[in-house]
Interface confidence: medium
C-alpha cells in the first residue's frame, strides 16, 4: 500500500516565499512519520524535513541551507519556504514516510509542484517637488 | 498541583449522542495543548483527539474523524469531546490529558477518567 500525496501544479513566491502543502491520504495523527520536500526532476535536493514521533516536538529542519519551517495538519504537511531566490525556480516534490506503526509506508511519486520565484522589483519612490518658484 | 476531572460519561444507544467536560487547574490551562485518549476493555491506550492551546489546530484519529468535535473554553479551564453517532466500539473509558507538544507525542498528566458504554 501506498500513500498518495496531493500538491498544487504550480505556486508562485511573490515575495520569495511561499507556502506548500503537501495533502496525504493518510491520517498522521499519533503517527512516526518523516515528511520531506524534495527539488528538481530527480529529487535531488532535500529541501526541508518536518519529522514527528512520540517523545519530542515536532523536529522541522534543512540541511542544504534553505529557509523552512512546517506546520502538521490531520492529512497534511504544510512547509513555508522564505528568502527563496529566483534561480531556486524548479518543480519541487512531497514525500512522506510512516515508520510506527508498522507496516512502513511511503508514497507514490505525485506530480510535483513548480515553484516560480519571482524576483523582487524595487519601484522607485514618486517624486515630489518642492514648492514651486514663480 | 495539576488535576484533570472528568465527567459526562454514562449509557448510551448507538447512534446517540454525549458531551464530555474535563476541569482543569494547577496550571496555567490557556497556554497548555490538551487530548482525549481512550481505552477500551482489554485494549491499550487509543489517542482520539487534540487541540492547540489557543484552540485553533484540531486533530482527530480515523476512527472518530467526522463524528467527534474537540472543544475548549479558556475562561473556565474546561477542556470538552463532543461525541455523536456513537457506536458500540466506542465503549470506552475516557481520559483527558495534558498534552505539552503535538499531536504525535504523550501526555504528562491525565486525569482518572470517565467510562462510556454504547448499547442497546
Known amino acids: 500500500n501506498k500513500i498518495l500525496v496531493k500538491q498544487s501544479p504550480m505556486l508562485v513566491a511573490y515575495d520569495n516565499a511561499v507556502n506548500l502543502s503537501c495533502k496525504y491520504s493518510y491520517n498522521l495523527f499519533s503517527r512516526e512519520f518523516r515528511a520531506s520536500l524534495h527539488k528538481g526532476l530527480d529529487s535531488a535536493v532535500e529541501v526541508c524535513v518536518v519529522y514527528g514521533n512520540y517523545s519530542q516536538q515536532l523536529q522541522v529542519y534543512s540541511k542544504t541551507g534553505f529557509n523552512c519551517d512546517g506546520k502538521l495538519g490531520n492529512e497534511s504537511v504544510t512547509f513555508y519556504l522564505q528568502n527563496l531566490y529566483v534561480n531556486q525556480t524548479d518543480i519541487y516534490f512531497c514525500k512522506i514516510e510512516v515508520m510506527y506503526p508498522p507496516p512502513y509506508l511511503d508514497n507514490e511519486k505525485s506530480n510535483g509542484t513548480i515553484i516560480h520565484v519571482k524576483g523582487k522589483h524595487l519601484c522607485p519612490s514618486p517624486l515630489f517637488p518642492g514648492p514651486s518658484k514663480p | 498541583e495539576v488535576q484533570l476531572l472528568e465527567s459526562g460519561g454514562g449509557l448510551v444507544q448507538p447512534g446517540g449522542s454525549l458531551r464530555l467536560s474535563c476541569a482543569a487547574s494547577?496550571?496555567?490551562?490557556?497556554?497548555?495543548?490538551m487530548s482525549w485518549a481512550r481505552q477500551a476493555p482489554g485494549k491499550g491506550l487509543e489517542w482520539v483527539s487534540w487541540?492547540?492551546?489557543?484552540?485553533?489546530?484540531?486533530f482527530y484519529a480515523d476512527s472518530v474523524f467526522g463524528r467527534f468535535t474537540i472543544s475548549r473554553d479558556n475562561s473556565k479551564n474546561t477542556l470538552y469531546l463532543q461525541m455523536n453517532s456513537l457506536r458500540a466500539e466506542d465503549t470506552a473509558v475516557y481520559y483527558c490529558?495534558?498534552?505539552?507538544?503535538?499531536?504525535?507525542?504523550?501526555?504528562?498528566?491525565r486525569g482518572q477518567g470517565t467510562l462510556v458504554t454504547v448499547s442497546s
Open positions: 494547577g496550571f496555567t490551562f490557556d497556554s497548555a495543548n
Open positions: 487541540i492547540e492551546a489557543p484552540g485553533v489546530q484540531t
Open positions: 490529558a495534558r498534552s505539552p507538544f503535538g499531536p504525535l507525542y504523550g501526555f504528562d498528566y
